[in-house]
């Protein structure tokens, strides 16, 4: 990940002193109320405090900033806009804030945002244009680097009628604005698909982490653009096959390292190509540790020790032979 | 974390020599690793490079004499030298680049190779 | 080839001066921004001071900063202090069909007055 400054000698602001003081223009450089800071380290802090709100009053100074264990709730357009604008902020971890709502333009006048982190918040509603600021066809691009989006689904009960993947897939292709993302990480949301265009959107990522979800297929995503992929990330789905297509295109893919750990992979006929390639291949890492969860006969079975023998499908029987 | 390398001294022009660079701390295999050496009181040049899964680029007028390799059992990256001059003098440095910007962000201390007769 | 031209190739200057030294690629860097900055003292390997064109480096002083985008850039240290005194070297990274290339520039030493 990106080299960020760890925090030394931080100063606490006293929240007696910050209140008494509210109604004046905040000085320079202080420190928020519940924030530590450093301004050697040219960060703060704002950690398990339960704010409700981010502090108006932020260092100008600031380039990692923490807000993490918070109760946000909602990020605003402008929630960062300041004046003069925090021009050096970085890196921005908001994880676990509960936060369920990100509006449009949340991220705006923060020109320096190379990493954001929004993992651990039950994001019922974020909007197509939290990442690009604007509706309009093409955005300005966005200074984004890296995106955590781990475990931002929210509890089903509480999911808009729309689809969840759809839903942050809009915010990430919403007028190309991402299109310098280099690492995008979607780990823990229960996906159950990938739609198709994402991929091809997203041109310049090196690593994609889409472990943990509930993936089944890979056959309509696309990796072809993805010339600069490094690694990524599929452990812990739903992954009953890979097919030709995506396994040539896998290969195809200079520096691609795949991570298949812990999917249910069905071992019968359809699983003679991918058995043939993971025996050639050098993308799949730890490859010998896949195994097969079906059928029943073949559970356990490691992948690269098969052959085309153990590979059948049962006959379909005619409907007058079937039974239920 | 740290890269140190070894196998630097004294060789023949014509010769041929294979430098070390040992990582500890990290994964090798995780990391695209670059070779680059400075001539005494010269400048910074860029021999080549070896991506994660180890897939190989070079400045132009090192390919065809100089390889990068890498062992990832024994987390060493290596720099195979053949044909040497007394132009290729200098000391070899080994960097590690970062896993998202390319800049090299971690740098061993250098070994010297001297092409003499 | 790509070529990073540096300039000026030496200067001197006092404790407390803003120094600048620009550096020009002869084509446009990865992604336009893949340019870095490094400051090397004499016996010792380089060490990063900017990356990403602006981005400063972990444990890097904040009188150091870095500009630019494309083909020209600029770094400039606002105001010099003792242990500044060393040489400055930029690093751009280049792809192509054919792939990856590096370069440095020539460097930029920077002298006591």
């Known amino acids: 990940s990106s080299p960020t400054s760890s925090a030394s000698s931080f100063s606490s602001s006293a929240p007696f002193l910050a209140s008494a003081v509210s109604a004046q223009p905040p000085l320079p450089d202080q420190c928020p109320a519940l924030c530590e800071c450093s301004e050697a380290a040219r960060t703060v802090k704002c950690v398990n405090r339960n704010l409700t709100e981010v502090p108006t009053d932020l260092p100008a100074y600031v380039r990692n900033l923490f807000l993490t264990g918070n109760q946000l709730a909602v990020l605003p357009a402008g929630a960062f806009a300041r004046r003069p604008p925090l021009a050096e902020l970085a890196a921005l971890n908001l994880s676990g804030s509960r936060l369920d709502e990100v509006r449009a333009g949340a991220f705006e006048h923060l020109p320096s945002l190379r990493q954001l982190d929004l993992s651990h918040n039950p994001l019922a509603d974020l909007s197509p244009f939290a990442f690009s600021g604007s509706n309009a066809s093409v955005s300005a691009p966005s200074p984004l680097v890296e995106l955590i989006l781990n475990h931002i689904v929210p509890p089903e009960d509480e999911r808009q009628n729309r689809s969840f993947e759809g839903m942050v897939v809009a915010a990430l292709l919403a007028g190309r604005a991402l299109q310098g993302l280099r690492r995008l990480e979607l780990a823990s949301n229960h996906f159950l698909y990938l739609p198709r265009d994402v991929l091809a959107q997203l041109p310049s990522l090196r690593h994609l982490d889409l472990s943990n979800n509930s993936l089944v297929s890979l056959t309509y995503v696309s990796f072809r653009n993805l010339t600069h992929l490094e690694s990524l990330h599929l452990e812990d789905n739903a992954l009953k096959v890979l097919h030709n297509g995506t396994l040539a295109e896998l290969q195809g893919l200079p520096h691609i390292r795949v991570f298949l750990d812990n999917n249910p992979w069905v071992c019968d006929c359809h699983m003679a190509d991918m058995v043939t390639w993971l025996k050639e291949t050098e993308v799949v890492q730890g490859k010998d540790r896949l195994t097969c969860a079906y059928p029943e006969k073949m559970r356990n079975r490691v992948l690269l020790e098969l052959n085309s023998a153990d590979l059948d499908c049962d006959p379909i029987l005619p409907p007058s032979l079937q039974t239920s | 974390q740290s890269v140190e390398e070894s196998g630097g001294g004294l060789v023949q022009p014509g010769g041929s020599l294979r430098l070390s660079c040992a990582a500890s701390?990290?994964?090798?295999?995780?990391?695209?690793m670059s070779w680059v050496r400075q001539a005494c009181g010269k400048g910074l040049e860029w021999i080549g490079i070896?991506?994660?899964?180890?897939?190989?680029y070079y400045a132009s007028w090192a390919k065809g004499r100089f390889t990068i390799s890498r062992d990832n059992s024994k987390n060493t990256l290596y720099l195979q030298m053949n044909s040497l001059r007394a132009e290729d003098t200098a000391v070899y440095y080994c960097?590690?680049?970062?896993?998202?910007?390319?800049?090299?962000?971690?740098w061993g201390q250098g070994t010297l190779v001297t092409v003499s007769s | 080839a790509q070529v990073l031209t540096q300039s000026p190739s030496s200067l001197s200057a006092s404790v407390g001066d803003r120094v600048t030294i620009t550096c020009q690629s002869s084509?446009?860097?990865?992604?336009?921004?893949?340019l870095s900055w490094y400051q090397q003292k004499p016996g010792k390997a380089p060490k990063l001071l900017i990356y990403?064109?602006?981005t400063l480096a972990s444990g890097v002083p904040s009188r150091f900063s870095g500009s630019g985008s494309g083909t020209d850039f600029t770094l400039t240290i606002s105001s010099l202090q003792p242990e500044d005194f060393a040489t400055y070297y930029c690093?751009?990274?280049?792809?192509?069909?054919?792939?990856?290339?590096?370069?440095f520039g020539g460097g930029t030493k920077v002298e006591i007055k």
């Open positions: 960097a590690r680049v970062s896993s998202i910007y390319y800049t090299f962000n971690l």
């Open positions: 070896i991506a994660g899964r180890g897939s190989t």
């Open positions: 084509q446009s860097v990865y992604s336009n921004n893949e």
């Open positions: 701390g990290f994964s090798l295999s995780s990391y695209w």
């Open positions: 990403y064109a602006s």
């Open positions: 690093q751009g990274s280049y792809y192509s069909g054919s792939g990856w290339y590096y370069a």
